[in-house]
Interface confidence: low
Amino acid sequence: MNGRVDYLVTEEEINLTRGPSGLGFNIVGGTDQQYVSNDSGIYVSRIKENGAAALDGRLQEGDKILSVNGQDLKNLLHQDAVDLFRNAGYAVSLRVQHRLQVQNGPIGHRGEGDPSG
């Protein structure tokens, strides 16, 4: 009997300091460039080696970025999101959503993960 793959979604505030090469990651998504079906959100597509995000270590490829410096990223065109990141300043606060894949046994109970404790 196979187990089921569940997901736990956790949110986290990540504060990055812009480096010489920017924040050190690439994004995909937007209302004109959906990365995930029926979701126009902004996602991290690549973490640049030795960039600010990589050195901080918390941001992961595949993470969804919910806001930048408190500004919601919902319903933005891709280029608008890119511009928002470029103009976000030296100290940048990101609200991100991680998704963990959980190996569950056959008698799993689907429930919400609470990352805060």
């Epitope: 089921r4 901080d56 992961q60 595949g62 991680h98 963990l100 894949q101 959980v102 190996q103």
Partner: nanobody, 120 residues
Framework: HVQLVESGGGLVQPGGSLRLSCTAS????????MGWVRQAPGKGPEWVAT???????HYRNSVKGRFTISRDNAKNTLHLQMNSLKPEDTAVYYC???????????????RGQGTQVTVS
């Protein structure tokens, strides 16, 4: 083929310690966020701890200072050292793998029984 096998659970008295292990095959754990999740009887799964590819670690508030997550890249194994265990830590503990790349990609379902930890 990705497989995670958890071990190290058992019955322990309050205040005791256990060390859980999760051996991964099919990919190097050092390139992913890895973590532990637990599920108590009749409850939904709850996040316990995460170690990111950089080595940065995060813990749920109720286990901070008691649990330590670590990894052995050479053995491709994830560990959870659990000290000062409490009855409320009783649960099945599952190894978890961060999703890399496409956010909603679900890898093939696979077997995973977790490891039972009972504090009594």
């Amino acid at each position: 083929h990705v497989q995670l096998v958890e071990s190290g659970g058992g019955l322990v008295q309050p205040g005791g310690s256990l060390r859980l292990s999760c051996t991964a095959s099919g990919y190097p754990i050092s390139t992913y966020a890895m973590g532990w999740v637990r599920q108590a009887p009749g409850k939904g799964p709850e996040w316990v701890a995460t170690i990111y590819y950089s080595g940065v670690t995060h813990y749920r508030n109720s286990v901070k200072g008691r649990f330590t997550i670590s990894r052995d890249n050479a053995k491709n194994t994830l560990h959870l050292q659990m000290n000062s265990l409490k009855p409320e830590d009783t649960a099945v503990y599952y190894c978890a793998k961060g999703v890399n790349g496409t956010y909603l990609r679900v890898e093939a379902e696979y077997r995973g029984q977790g490891t039972q930890v009972t504090v009594s």
